[in-house]
């Protein structure tokens, strides 16, 4: 998909930045999400892992965010095929991932 | 080139005060949290405070709290610690320590400066 | 609050690698950065992020973190690496940065 400006990220990786550093209990109930190769994958696969989760308020804009940055309506296991070897995370996890990566994306000049 | 400042430190008996100061060039100061890091002679690091690059967030270690206050000016591009009601186990290095990277407090402390002693005797 | 359990020492000869652990409740979901600390010198970033590298560290020093251990890697050990390690989080609980006890890291021979 088209890479989103480095406005929109920056704001992707603070509302990242405000889940992890905030995180008072187990995000999400500790639910678990596909494991996924970011590198390979992107902004859809990365939702399309997250839309198996419902009901967490926590990770709702994050969400919409990544919504924004995907070009056509992302369904549930649309991208299996970027799973990693089938492993489940907890979102927690998922989400310090994407936060990293992203962080690195940044890193590298490759959304300034 | 980044460089990290301290000074202010010195001698001070039981209950007195100091104040530190971190003066900090070579990067956008406003954009990255800060933080300030001690070590009592023969010891480990023990973190003390962290602000935001705002200065609208602080955060402070349990042994610190209500005692010592940190604070930024952006427009001088420094850091400060004012530290009261000093107690003999405050006697320490104290190093300032910049975020890695913009946003949050989550980040490694990329740069530090060399320390300002910080001795609490009677 | 959040404890990070680091071995006070680690011995390992010249030319080996050494590992150094830091034990922490479901360290694997938070984020860890080590240092390099040698005497009367304040400390040096050498991994952060878990596993990535500032500019500057040689590639001899790698980092992991998974589960409730992470580990700092340094691989063909020089007598120069002899120092005292940290491992430092950030505890959302808390809102505290922790750093671990240190590791001593002695260079035999």
């Known amino acids: 998909g088209p890479v989103p400006p480095s406005t929109a990220l920056r704001e992707l990786i603070e509302e990242l930045v405000n889940i992890t550093q905030n995180q008072k209990a187990p995000l999400c109930n500790g639910s678990m999400v596909w494991s996924i190769n970011l590198t390979a994958g992107g902004f859809c696969v990365a939702l399309d892992s997250l839309t198996n989760v419902s009901g967490c308020s926590a990770i709702e804009k994050t969400q919409r965010m990544l919504s924004g940055f995907c070009p056509h309506k992302v369904s549930a296991g649309q991208f299996s095929s970027l799973h990693v070897r089938d492993t489940k995370i907890e979102v927690a996890q998922f989400v310090k991932d994407l936060l990293l990566h992203l962080k690195k994306l940044f890193r590298e000049g490759q959304f300034n | 080139e980044v460089q990290l400042l301290e000074s202010g430190g010195g001698l001070v008996q039981p209950g007195g005060s100091l104040r530190l100061s971190c003066a900090a060039s070579g990067f956008t100061f406003s954009s990255y949290a800060m933080s300030w890091v001690r070590q009592a002679p023969g010891k480990g690091l023990e973190w003390v405070s962290a602000i935001s690059g705002s200065g609208g967030s602080t955060y402070y270690a349990d042994s610190v709290k209500g005692r010592f206050t940190i604070s930024r000016d952006n427009s001088k591009n420094t850091l400060y610690l004012q530290m009261n009601s000093l107690r003999a186990e405050d006697t320490a290095v104290y190093y300032c320590?910049?975020?890695?990277?913009?946003?949050?407090?989550?980040?490694?402390?990329?740069?530090w400066g060399q320390g300002t002693l910080v001795t609490v005797s009677s | 609050s959040y404890v990070l359990t680091q071995p006070p020492s680690v011995s390992v000869a010249p030319g080996q690698t050494a590992r150094i652990t830091c034990g922490g409740n479901n360290i694997g979901n938070k984020i860890v950065h080590w240092y390099q600390q040698k005497p009367g010198q304040a400390p040096v970033l050498v991994v952060y992020?878990?596993?990535d590298r500032p500019s500057g560290i040689p590639e001899r020093f790698s980092g992991s973190n998974s589960g409730n251990t992470a580990t700092l890697t340094i691989s063909r050990v020089e007598a120069g690496d002899e120092a005292d390690y940290y491992c430092?989080?950030?505890?959302?609980?808390?809102?505290?940065?922790?750093f671990g006890g240190g590791t001593k890291l002695t260079v035999l021979g």
């Open positions: 430092q989080v950030w505890d959302s609980s808390s809102d505290h940065v922790v």
């Open positions: 320590a910049k975020a890695d990277f913009w946003s949050g407090t989550l980040w490694g402390f990329d740069y």
């Open positions: 992020d878990d596993s």
